[in-house]
Interface confidence: medium
């Protein structure tokens, strides 16, 4: 029988009555244009909903918007449009919500053409009250909060001015003109690129990268001939034009741009691109596009300095700059990433790594699934996951893969089972061990979300017809119950739950459509009465992550350590609760050569775990070098993989070589790093 119909699945008793008492409908009695929803703060229950519609007139488009506020996780909403003087809010800027629990909100208003500047509405009390502020400029981007101080705001103007506010948008100061891109760094530092002559587009590759650490009082030029820049983890990256031709190279800094190193990565031409796929304080996943319109490139993983890169995955699917890739960080288990490759026959296949890009492999075929028509051998095939690339291709995939750090090991994704991704209607699959094994969870495409740190999974069928049924599981997707949340079906547009997967409330958004009426409606369901009791010690079981061979002493060792987690038993129907903290017990592993990558000037011959010196650094290899305050580079040929915590065991000792003669970089000479004051 189908999942959810077994006798043993009837564990949740009287759930219809329990859920009916906790289902709250809200009809937004005025519209059906577009709707955007933002959570304000963490565990506050405050949601802001901005509804917008445009009335097309002959000469112009007249817009109208309404603002609603809930403080009970969406069960009830109050129209607070009057707090923003019934002003039309620009949806392209969205609602700028302050970091952490600052309670700050900035809404950017639409103003008439002749006005001197834009207008914002600011709240510091979780949208209970708003202050109107007229700006001395027209904003081009949403207001950007400093991650360290939510009173500090940054914005670019339509005239490419860089504006800063130190008092949460009350007063603004233009600190620089001719700015293309600006970003907050750490410690309230601002990085930005600026053009000297024409415009951002015309000067691409000739931009300067500047830094201010005092909100615009003084500046330092930290890069020239810049194409673009990015921040990832503790790394600052700059894509820099080469002297002689139109190629560009990645340079890396770990000291906010004071010193730079040239990354040991291939240079790219005009039509190619670099992309930071993922970055943390330890390392970076970098995609380097192949020459030509191939739609793929190579993934490289960095060392702890962001300088030395190991080739991680060939033929990585990534269509164009700013295009789509399937690269997914599985946040529910350390070291796990999923992505897609474009094989020689142009089919797309999914690959997974469990060790932060060290090795990639196909996903194991789910036990309860057959190989589809793409499989040559009906007994041997793999699971292939649909991610944002599939969504961009308009396949019937309503959601990207889902994982949450506090729902340990759980990964939910649409996929197909065969030799490659299929364009047929996908099913939904779940892994409870971070991607090692998979099970078909739901037939056909669905929207899904995780509640109560994995204690409940909720799903809604993706259908063009109106729906009125929600499915939920209390055992990590093995068994499903269905609940009819409304008598009158709605056209479903989205599921909303508080970010962080700790909530037990889910909001179902959609619209009703009848001959006379088309309006937004939300149903918020609180599952608190389904999980009646708090989980106790007996409800949890010990689970060793990354375990593939229990007989092996090193079983579960990934990046030099193994972790045991306390995980909720599938049979336990109880609340993890909002304050649930993942309990894990790490233990250090012995080092092997697998825990090291080859340093600059060294490589691993195929099928060998030893690093050997490159015979000679010649030609363009000479540019792969370290430039900084130090005059020389020393190495023993091995470098510990970033984040690897192994101890003892293999300790590769090498004669230290001085490579300074082999290495030059001309990115920035210290004399160019002049300081400027306002």
């Amino acid at each position: 029988s189908a999942p959810g119909e077994d006798e043993e699945c009837g564990r949740v008793r009287d759930f219809v009555a329990k859920l009916a008492n906790n289902t709250h409908q809200h009809v937004f009695d005025d519209l059906r244009g577009s709707v955007s929803l933002s959570w304000v703060g963490d565990s506050t229950g405050v949601i802001l909903v901005l509804t917008t519609f445009h009335v097309p007139l002959v000469i112009m488009t007249f817009g109208q918007s309404k603002l609603y506020r809930s403080e009970d996780y969406g069960k009830n909403f109050k129209d607070i449009t009057d707090l923003i003087n019934n002003t039309f809010i620009r949806t392209e800027f969205g609602m700028a919500i302050g970091p952490e629990n600052s309670g700050k909100v900035v809404l950017t208003a639409e103003v008439s053409g002749g006005s001197r500047g834009g207008r914002i509405f600011r709240s510091s009390d979780f949208a209970k009250n708003f202050v109107q502020t007229d700006l001395p400029f027209h904003p081009l981007t949403q207001m950007m909060y400093s991650p360290q101080n939510s009173d500090y705001l940054l914005a670019l103007s339509t005239e490419n001015g860089l504006w800063v506010s130190k008092n949460f948008g009350g007063k603004w100061e233009e600190i620089h003109k001719a700015v293309c891109l600006a970003k907050w760094g750490s410690d309230n530092t601002i990085f930005f690129t600026t053009y000297a002559n024409g415009s951002c587009k015309a000067d691409l590759g000739a931009l300067e990268l500047w830094r201010t650490s005092d909100l615009g009082k003084s500046f330092k030029t930290i890069g020239v001939k810049i194409y673009s820049f990015g921040l990832g983890g503790r790394f600052l990256f700059a894509s820099v034009m080469a002297d002689k031709d139109t190629t560009r190279r990645i340079h890396v800094s770990t000291d906010q741009g004071d010193t730079w190193s040239m990354a040991q990565l291939p240079s790219v031409g005009q039509e190619q691109f670099y992309s930071i796929l993922a970055a943390n304080d330890d390392m970076v996943f970098m995609h380097v596009d192949e020459p030509g319109d191939t739609g793929f490139g190579t993934i490289f993983t960095s060392d702890d300095r962001g300088i030395v890169y190991s080739k991680s995955l060939d033929r990585h699917l990534y269509t164009t700059t700013g295009g789509e890739t399937a690269f997914t960080n599985v946040t529910s288990l350390r070291g796990v990433y999923i992505t897609s490759v474009l094989s020689e026959d142009n089919s797309i296949q999914t690959m997974i790594t469990f060790d932060q890009g060290g090795r990639w492999t196909h996903l194991r075929k789910p036990e309860n699934s057959e190989c589809d028509a793409t499989a040559k051998n009906k007994n041997e095939c793999s699971l292939h996951i649909h991610a944002s690339y599939s969504i961009s291709q308009k396949l019937n995939v309503p959601m990207a893969p889902l994982s949450e750090p506090n729902a340990v090991g759980i990964v939910i994704a649409h996929g197909s089972v065969g030799d490659a991704i299929s364009v047929m209607v996908p099913d939904v699959y779940i892994s409870d061990d971070g991607g090692y094994s998979w099970t078909k969870m739901l037939e056909g495409p669905h929207y899904y979300t995780i509640l109560d740190s994995g204690g409940i999974i909720v799903a809604i069928e993706h259908s063009s017809r109106p729906i009125n049924v929600i499915k939920f599981s209390t055992d990590e997707g093995q068994c499903w119950q269905t609940y009819t949340f409304t008598r009158d079906p709605i056209y479903f547009t989205g599921l909303a739950s508080e970010p962080g997967a700790r909530s037990m409330n889910i909001s179902i958004w959609g619209f009703t459509e009848s001959f006379l009426t088309s309006q937004w409606v939300s149903y918020t369901i609180d599952f608190k009465d389904i999980l009646e009791r708090n989980c106790e010690e007996k409800d949890y079981t010990i689970w060793l992550a990354h375990s593939t061979d229990p007989e092996d002493y090193e079983d579960g060792c990934i990046l030099g350590y193994k972790e045991q987690f306390l995980r909720l038993r599938k049979s336990s129907v109880c609340q993890n609760g909002r304050d649930y903290v993942v309990t894990k017990q790490p233990s250090i592993c012995l080092c092997s050569l697998e825990d090291f990558l080859c340093d600059f000037g060294y490589y691993r011959p195929e099928n060998d775990s030893k690093c050997v010196e490159q015979p000679e650094l010649k030609g363009h290899d000479l540019e792969f070098c370290l430039y900084g305050r130090e005059e020389h580079l020393t190495t023993n040929g091995y470098r510990k993989i970033p984040g690897d915590k192994c101890q003892g065991g293999v300790n590769p000792v090498r004669e230290v070589k001085d490579l300074k003669k082999k290495c030059t970089s001309n990115f920035l000479s210290p004399e160019k790093q002049n300081s400027k004051s306002n």
Partner: antibody, heavy 124, light 106 residues
Framework: QVQLVQSGAEVKKPGSSVKVSCKAS????????ISWVRQAPGQGLEWMGG????????NYAQKFQGRVTITADESTSTAYMELSSLRSEDTAVYYC?????????????????WGQGTTVTVSS | DIQMTQSPSTLSASVGDRVTITCRAS??????LAWYQQKPGKAPKLLIY???SLESGVPSRFSGSGSGTEFTLTISSLQPDDFATYYC????????FGGGTKVEIK
């Protein structure tokens, strides 16, 4: 300015069907609804049903359920009303009207543009 | 279906008079009510929508009020062009019209 132009007068035998067309010109067709209203000689207005062209969503008054079919062709901006099993009491002037809907775009219920009317006579 | 009852069915008045027509719904229809004017041999013309909003191009002597179940159309100063039949129409569920009020010359 939006105009609704209806097809010409019809004389029908009892038991037969009539199909009246209503073509919109000069404005948006799809976001509104088209209502059909009839008026028997010397009587008041009677709503028969309507359609939302954008989704082909038809809606009928209880009295006419099963006897009336309302359709729309977005490509030609034309709505149609077909009434079957005609009887003498169906003799009336049939109007189409543009019906505002309670949506983000047209925020009222009111028939703001009307066709000129089509006289249908049912007689043996 | 919601029933709409209009009163009076006939009303005799003179030019310059203030005229009031009432429409009662069998259940609450919020503000989803429209008023129309119809002259013999012509299609109806929308005067008021959403109970009190004046359709563009309609003279300001026409006004609508009410919500829930009781609604009123008022002509503040009757003009020669205003002698016609007036209909109310609800649009809360299926559409229904009132029976009409004929305004004739006294």
């Amino acid at each position: 300015q939006v105009q609704l132009v209806q097809s010409g007068a019809e004389v029908k035998k009892p038991g037969s069907s009539v199909k009246v067309s209503c073509k919109a010109s000069g404005g948006t067709f799809r976001n509104y609804a088209i209502s059909w209203v009839r008026q028997a000689p010397g009587q008041g207005l009677e709503w028969m049903g309507g359609i939302i062209p954008i989704g082909g969503w038809a809606n009928y008054a209880q009295k006419f359920q099963g006897r009336v079919t309302i359709t729309a062709d977005e490509s030609t901006s034309t709505a149609y009303m077909e009434l079957s099993s005609l009887r003498s009491e169906d003799t009336a002037v049939y109007y189409c009207a543009r019906q505002g809907r309670k949506t983000g775009y047209y925020y009222y219920y009111g028939m703001d543009v009307w066709g000129q009317g089509t006289t249908v006579t049912v007689s043996s | 279906d919601i029933q709409m009852t209009q009163s009076p069915s006939t009303l005799s008045a003179s030019v310059g008079d203030r005229v009031t027509i009432t429409c009662r719904a069998s259940q609450s229809i919020s503000s989803w009510l429209a008023w129309y004017q119809q002259k013999p041999g012509k299609a109806p013309k929308l005067l008021i929508y959403k109970a009190s909003s004046l359709e563009s191009g309609v003279p300001s002597r026409f006004s609508g009020s009410g919500s829930g179940t009781e609604f009123t159309l008022t002509i503040s100063s009757l003009q020669p062009d205003d002698f016609a039949t007036y209909y109310c129409q609800q649009a809360d569920g299926h559409i229904t019209f009132g029976g009409g009020t004929k305004v004739e010359i006294k």
